[in-house]
Interface confidence: low
């Protein structure tokens, strides 16, 4: 008889809301520790007194903020992505560095270079990297602009990565480009300095190819105190990676069951 | 005591595989009918004898085949997308039509025009359209090519839509571009003929902007019998839309519960 | 992942995608769907056997989370993760129709 | 959708996302997470009350599918649909760390 079959499969109908909440809270206790691969909460004995350092809070806020170009809904996570990812950021090499000299003149592009030794310090192995975002603070924009992102390849060649249509805006806005594959390449190679180019989209028949958008970190001649704030908000790579010690656990439990 | 709590929430542990299969099969019976908004299977009294028409099979195969540029995994479905979508296709206006005359000469672009009356016949209301894909059969390609898709806007202006990096290939391959928003616009407007342009990506400093990729439906001087096959495989719009009669149901049950 | 590659070739007792081919004629008694003749619907089945209790050894439970309760549910459940659509051909009167049905084929499962 | 907008402002008895704020200090007795102090974890709860039986009127069952058993499961279950990550700040020894935990916040649920 069908009725019995249904009972075999259905859950108990009388569910106590408080019990479910308690079980959910206990499950979250385990979930957080398990995602961090901690058997128990970490000791707080050595924690320095006082508030969190500015840089740590800035990094926490970068991670918390949803920015233009980031996908709102995460994909179903691969198994390794269950575990927590350490978040670090690497600022762009400052624009007075000599690397920029040969690229300064173009009206249709800006260039952003990164020190790969800093990247390697943050992420020692390419395989540990789970996401890398290039974040740029775009200032006010009067007209719509179509921009393209390129990766520096060999000496003077550039490889197209992605594009974005930027709507006019009265307020500054963070832009994010997913550059995970590129940063993984950089970590695998021996180069010291690697870079991106942000260019106006050039159509085959259009004449005006000027990059109108103003990206924080490139405007010159500003007041000293403002320049510091400006420098902190210059383009950076936001990196999410499995810490080395956690990765060793993962290696050994790769064969799942 | 915790043990009792667990029992309250967990499902019965002894699950009969055959029972589950039977229930899954019965659930699918209901699911298919409900997605088609049918209370019972349709009558087969008037179905013509013989195999399915060529055009129907071609359409079915277009829907079944996964093509380059289509996302492999569907997003979580909004409520209206639960219901089945009728699939139709509208072929590009043939290249001997006068509309193409003023666009013929370019080495960096090809043009594809569509008759909006055919689109409206397939999808009477813009709101009914759930997906529109532009499908192109690209032939062999010797070198990597970066192409861009544009929508015809006002008289001679074109609006950028998307881009694709085409890898070299020895065999033909269907490409798909999501043009849902554009086709929805066309259905809302009064135009008779609307179109797309596929162009080589032009970088601001590069010289050679020739479109190398050969798209089926544009190559001239081929044998008569081949030309027919070629014509059938010319660019088309694959449309997925809620049939009008099904949409009326949806309207009335919009306020869900 | 608990997908067809892993589950169809293993004897996994816990949550996994299970093989189920539905032949429209044989299983549903339907002749009205002209294409396809049937499809691999599959389904999810198996316990998500993480149970939180005060006497469970903490570190053991933690190691089980990724498989059995990644979403930290109060009562985890074996459900579809990746789904694919199914196009069908059928007639309404004399007119053949091609329709696409979303989320019909289960490719992988998860405890949620 | 069975999301926070709909579920938090209704008295829905069936599958829906339910409000749950977790204060790390009060609910878990933890002082080691420095930021945030807590978060809206939420959870899914409620029956997916479609039951197939031979005496159920066919057309009624069909109308219920979209809500209660869209995936045509043998035993549908109320589970998370949209999830969001949670960044946290904690110390390992003297070193502060920022880590992102995936799929921690339930934004909407579905019967699956």
């Amino acid at each position: 008889d069908y009725k019995d079959d249904d009972d075999k499969l259905s859950t108990s109908k009388t569910i106590d809301m408080e019990l479910v909440k308690r079980k959910r809270i206990e499950a979250i206790r385990g979930q957080i520790l398990s995602k961090l691969r901690l058997a128990s909460p970490p000791s707080q004995g050595e924690v320095p007194p006082g508030p969190l350092p500015e840089a740590v809070l800035a990094l926490y806020n970068s991670t918390r903020d949803r920015v233009a170009g980031e996908s709102a809904e995460p994909e179903p996570e691969p198994e390794a992505d269950y575990y927590a990812k350490e978040v670090t950021r690497v600022l762009m090499v400052e624009t007075h560095n000599e690397i920029y000299d040969k690229f300064k003149q173009s009206t249709h592009s800006i260039y952003m270079f990164f020190n790969t030794s800093e990247l390697r310090e943050a992420v020692p192995e390419p395989v540990l990297l789970s996401r890398a975002e290039l974040r740029l603070l775009r200032l006010k924009l009067k007209v719509e602009q179509h921009v393209e992102l390129y990766q520096k390849y060999s000496n003077n060649s550039w490889r197209y990565l992605s594009n974005r249509l930027l709507a006019p805006s009265d307020s500054p806005e963070w832009l994010s480009f997913d550059v995970t594959g590129v940063v993984r390449q950089w970590l695998s190679r021996g180069g010291e300095i690697e870079g991106f180019r942000l260019s106006a989209h050039c159509s085959c028949d259009s004449k005006d190819n000027t990059l109108q958008v103003d990206i924080n970190g490139f405007t010159t001649g500003r007041r000293g105190d403002l320049a510091t704030i400006h420098g902190m908000n210059r383009p950076f790579l936001l990196l999410m990676a499995t810490p080395l010690e956690r990765a060793q656990h993962l290696q050994s439990s790769r064969h799942r069951r | 005591d915790y043990k009792d709590d667990d029992d309250k929430l967990s499902t019965s542990k002894t699950i009969d595989m055959e029972l589950v299969k039977r229930k899954r099969i019965e659930a699918i019976r209901g699911q298919i009918l409900s997605k088609l908004r049918l209370a019972s299977p349709p009558s087969q009294g008037e179905v013509p004898p013989g195999p399915l028409p060529e055009a129907v099979l071609a359409l079915y195969n277009s829907t079944r085949d996964r093509v380059a540029g289509e996302s492999a995994e569907p997003e979580p479905e909004p409520e209206a997308d639960y219901y089945a979508k009728e699939v139709t296709r509208v072929l590009m206006v043939e290249t001997h039509n006068e509309i193409y005359d003023k666009f013929k000469q370019s080495t960096h672009s090809i043009y594809m025009f569509f008759n909006t009356s055919e689109l409206r016949e397939a999808v009477p209301e813009p709101v009914l359209l759930s997906r529109a894909e532009l499908r192109l059969l690209r032939l062999k390609l010797k070198v990597e090519q970066h192409v861009e898709l544009y929508q015809k806007y006002s008289n001679n202006s074109w609006r950028y839509l998307s881009n694709r990096l085409l890898a070299p290939s020895d065999s033909p391959e269907w490409l798909s571009f999501d043009v849902t928003g554009v086709v929805r616009q066309w259905l809302s407007r009064g135009g008779e003929i609307e179109g797309f342009r596929l162009s080589a990506h032009c970088s601001c400093d590069s010289k050679d902007n020739t479109l190398q990729v050969d798209i089926n439906g544009f190559t001239t001087g081929r044998r008569g019998d081949l030309a027919t096959i070629h014509g059938m495989n010319r660019p088309f719009l694959l449309l997925m839309a809620t049939p009008l009669e099904r949409a009326q149901h949806l309207q009335s049950s919009r306020h869900r519960r | 992942a608990l997908d067809t590659n892993y589950c169809f070739s293993s004897t996994e007792k816990n949550c996994c995608v299970r093989q189920l081919y539905i032949d429209f004629r044989k299983d549903l008694g339907w002749k009205w769907i002209h294409e396809p003749k049937g499809y691999h619907a599959n389904f999810c089945l198996g316990p998500c056997p993480y149970i939180w209790s005060l006497d469970t050894q903490y570190s053991k439970v933690l190691a089980l989370y990724n498989q059995h309760n990644p979403g930290a549910s109060a009562a985890p459940c074996c459900v579809p993760q990746a789904l694919e659509p199914l196009p069908i051909v059928y007639y309404v009167g004399r007119k053949p129709k091609v329709e696409q049905l979303s989320n019909m084929i289960v490719r992988s499962c998860k405890c949620s | 959708a069975l999301d926070t907008n709909y579920c938090f402002s209704s008295t829905e008895k069936n599958c829906c996302v339910r409000q749950l704020y977790i204060d790390f200090r009060k609910d878990l007795g933890w002082k080691w997470i420095h930021e945030p102090k807590g978060y809206h974890a939420n959870f899914c709860l409620g029956p997916c009350p479609y039951i197939w039986s031979l005496d159920t009127q066919y057309s009624k069952v069909l109308a219920l599918y979209n809500q209660h058993n869209p995936g045509a499961s043998a035993a549908p279950c109320c589970v998370p649909q949209a999830l969001e990550p949670l960044p946290i700040v904690y110390y390992v020894g003297r070193k502060p760390k920022v880590e992102q935990l995936s799929n921690m916040i339930v934004r909407s649920c579905k019967c699956s």
């Epitope: - | 399915l52 060529e54 099979l57 079915y60 065999s171 | 169809f8 070739s9 049937g38 499809y39 084929i105 | -």
Partner: antibody, heavy 122, light 108 residues
């Protein structure tokens, strides 16, 4: 009902070429995958290759250099072009309709022709 | 490439006997396996696909089982018309189709 009729077999000298045909009826040829299989006298079955609806072909490694599969949907006919024939190619050659189980490219031979005998001998 | 090994290569049995033929794949092919019957002077005939699904019109005394690398074809009660050669065939992922070497079922 489904019918497959192979033709073009016979005696051929080593090093020569031969083209086999398979005429199909009773099903929608252009929407089905088609296979060629051979069976040397007194031996087992050897899969040569198949051709998908789009014209894409897959062949066994040993068949790649000398054997070509093609189809003409307008004539409901499948072809096997065999070049540089050797004595070990002597066999009954079958064409078979491949059954595409939806959602995958998994193939089973759903219907077979009666076969045509090819004898390679000087 | 995957190898398919059938055993035994031949067997003698009587009408009414239960007959079992095995087929082993050199690597896992999930359940993507078919069984065929071939009588002298005739083409092969499909019996079973997906390891265990009986082709329509095939008598229910034929059954298939197994997954991964080990598969079995069972004839529960051998009939006179069942004396033939049986082949297994893998069709994992479609880019290679491999047959077993065959098992001849003869009258004892």
């Amino acid at each position: 009902q489904v019918q497959l009729v192979e033709s073009g077999g016979g005696v051929v000298q080593p090093g020569r070429s031969l083209r086999l045909s398979c005429a199909a009826s009773g099903f929608h040829f252009s929407s089905e995958a088609m296979n060629w299989i051979r069976q040397p006298p007194g031996k087992g079955l050897e899969w040569i290759g198949y051709i998908y609806v789009s014209g894409t072909t897959y062949r066994a490694d040993w068949a790649r250099g000398r054997f070509t599969i093609s189809r003409d949907n307008s004539k409901n006919t499948l072809y096997l072009q065999m070049n540089s024939l050797r004595a070990e190619d002597t066999a009954v050659y079958y064409c078979a309709r491949g059954w595409h189980i939806f959602g995958h490219h998994y193939w089973v031979m759903h219907a077979w022709g009666q076969g045509t005998l090819v004898t390679v001998s000087s | 490439d995957i190898q398919m090994t059938q055993s035994p290569s031949s067997l003698s049995a009587s009408v009414g006997d239960r007959v079992t033929i095995t087929c082993q794949a050199s690597e896992s092919i999930s359940t993507y396996l078919a069984w065929y019957q071939q009588k002298p002077g005739q083409p092969p005939k499909l019996l079973i696909y997906a390891a265990s699904t009986l082709e329509s019109g095939v008598p229910s005394r034929f059954s298939g089982s197994g997954s991964g690398t080990d598969f079995t074809l069972t004839i529960s009660s051998l009939q006179p018309e069942d004396f033939a050669t049986y082949y297994c065939q893998s069709y994992s992922d479609g880019d290679s189709v491999i047959f077993g070497q065959g098992t001849k079922v003869e009258i004892k």
